[in-house]
């Protein structure tokens, strides 16, 4: 990896678990100011593999609300608005980091957690099963 | 919101910024043990809106490596394997949380940051702009 010289102004840590336990400022900096005006907000409806968004809420997690995509159909929508079963709607999944309160119900102590979320759906050609 | 009784075993914090600055254990807990065997790993190639994955690396960020999807075509792939420009390939974007070293180059001090990443692509019907 890349070795970075340590900043002498860093907070000190005598924690024996260092650097496993770190200080995190929860004042979120949002780098998405320059997002594309062509928002993906309506893609879920206009896609050939449309999806619905389901709210997943967990007060012990940060962020507490995550939206999960569920493909509306097993097939894909064609130009006539019919469902083609020679194509399949599948969820696009991504691993994301969240903060889990640990110990539970603690307001200022968390553990990093990786979860898999479905972000949207895409239309794919079916897998070819080669028979021996 | 939901009020949760505070666990008496929580770490103490006299920090004036509390609860803005919290302790986070970086030993990641992976909740994705039960992932679907139908892995989405080959969807980028089989999709009617295929995409390439580009590595985005930043040592000041945790995770330092993020993979960004870029749609291969402006149109979508039709049944003949040709690009159909009556439809559009568009990126599905998601806001994710990352940790940004703050002050820079500090190993144990971070700030939460929201970034927008493209996870994959989907094929959508284009928006028709009616001219008055």
């Amino acid at each position: 990896g890349i070795t970075i010289p340590r900043n002498p102004g860093c907070p000190n840590s005598e924690d024996k678990n260092f650097p496993r336990t770190v200080m995190v400022n929860l004042n979120i900096h949002n780098r998405n100011t320059n997002t594309n005006p062509k928002r993906s907000s309506d893609y879920y409806n206009r896609s050939t593999s449309p999806w619905n968004l389901h709210r997943n809420e967990d007060p012990e997690r940060y962020p507490s609300v995550i939206w999960e995509a569920k493909c509306r159909h097993l097939g894909c929508i064609n130009a006539d608005g019919n469902v083609d079963y020679h194509m399949n709607s599948v969820p696009i999944q991504q691993e994301i980091l969240v903060l889990r309160r640990e110990p539970p119900h603690c307001p200022n102590s968390f553990r990093l957690e990786k979860i898999l979320v479905s972000v949207g759906c895409t239309c794919v050609t079916p897998i070819v099963h080669h028979v021996a | 919101g939901i009020t949760i009784p505070r666990n008496p075993g929580c770490p103490n914090s006299e920090d004036k910024n509390f609860p803005r600055t919290v302790m986070v254990n970086l030993n990641i807990h992976n909740r994705n043990t039960n992932t679907n065997p139908k892995r989405s790993s080959d969807y980028y190639n089989r999709s009617t809106s295929p995409w390439n994955l580009h590595r985005n690396e930043d040592p000041e960020r945790y995770p330092s490596v993020i993979w960004e999807a870029k749609c291969r075509h402006l149109g979508c792939i039709n049944a003949d394997g040709n690009v159909d420009y009556h439809m559009n390939s568009v990126p599905i974007q998601q806001e994710i949380l990352v940790l940004r070293r703050e002050p820079p180059h500090c190993p144990n001090s971070f700030r939460l940051e929201k970034i927008l990443v493209s996870v994959g692509c989907t094929c959508v019907t284009p928006i028709v702009h009616h001219v008055a």
């Epitope: 493909c71 509306r72 097939g75 079963y85 079916p126 | -």
Partner: antibody, heavy 118, light 113 residues
Framework: QAHLQQSGAELVRPGASVKLSCKAL????????MHWVKQTPVHGLEWIGV????????AYNQKFKGKATLTADKSSSTAYMELSSLTSEDSAVYYC???????????WGQGTTLTVSS | DIVMSQSPSSLAMSVGQKVTMNCKSN????????????LAWYQQKPGQSPKLLVD???TRESGVPDRFIGSGSGTDFSLTISSVQAEDLADYFC?????????FGSGTKLEIK
């Protein structure tokens, strides 16, 4: 082993509505779609529509749009089809059938006989 | 909508005879990406619901006797019973599941002489 259990025979008056049910047993309800098919001696087998309980999507045969409404209750693993403004033309045997991602409809319910008569 | 035409409408055969019924679609049911034909054959015995016999034009469902043979590709398909048995008395339907609305053939009634 998958099994689809349909509600019993119905005798209803013209102009009324009826809601037929189909309970899914022996498989994960949200992993498959539920198709509905009408059978009459005159028109044979006709596909009415499909619902995906996992994703909430529905698709209908144009012929049955406005006549049939498909819904699903995940908590009871039951699919429903409501038929409205009934006429004698709606008298038929109605089947629910499980569909996979290829559109294969492998398991069929026993059928519900609907008679519309005054 | 895809139109499915089935012939003949009825057949009377003796036990042990070979029987073939046909099904035509007005557009191809072949998916070039996986080389599968999205065509199914169903058997419906009197008073029962349809039972899936063959799918993807030629794949026999588990538990279906091997005397039932599906064949064909694109728009022309057939179901052959190599040696008819008394219990094969039924209506036989073809169905396309390539795209909605799914459509069925009008059926072939098999009678046993």
């Amino acid at each position: 082993q998958a099994h689809l259990q349909q509600s019993g025979a119905e005798l209803v008056r013209p102009g009324a509505s009826v809601k037929l049910s189909c309970k899914a047993l022996g498989y994960t309800f949200t992993d498959y779609e539920m198709h509905w098919v009408k059978q009459t001696p005159v028109h044979g087998l006709e596909w009415i529509g499909v619902i995906h309980p996992g994703g909430g999507g529905t698709a209908y045969n144009q012929k049955f749009k406005g006549k049939a409404t498909l819904t699903a209750d995940k908590s009871s693993s039951t699919a429903y089809m409501e038929l409205s403004s009934l006429t004698s033309e709606d008298s038929a045997v109605y089947y629910c059938t499980r569909g996979d991602h290829d559109g294969r409809t492998d398991y069929w319910g026993q059928g519900t006989t609907l008679t519309v008569s005054s | 909508d895809i139109v499915m035409s089935q012939s003949p409408s009825s057949l009377a055969m003796s036990v042990g005879q070979k029987v073939t019924m046909n099904c035509k679609s007005n557009q191809s049911l072949l998916n070039r990406s996986n080389q599968k034909n999205y065509l199914a054959w169903y058997q419906q015995k009197p008073g029962q619901s349809p039972k899936l016999l063959v799918d993807f034009a030629s794949t026999r469902e588990s538990g279906v006797p091997d005397r039932f043979i599906g064949s064909g590709s694109g728009t022309d398909f057939s179901l052959t019973i190599s040696s008819v048995q008394a219990e094969d008395l039924a209506d036989y339907f073809c169905q396309q599941h390539y795209t909605t609305p799914f459509t069925f053939g009008s059926g072939t009634k098999l009678e046993i002489k």
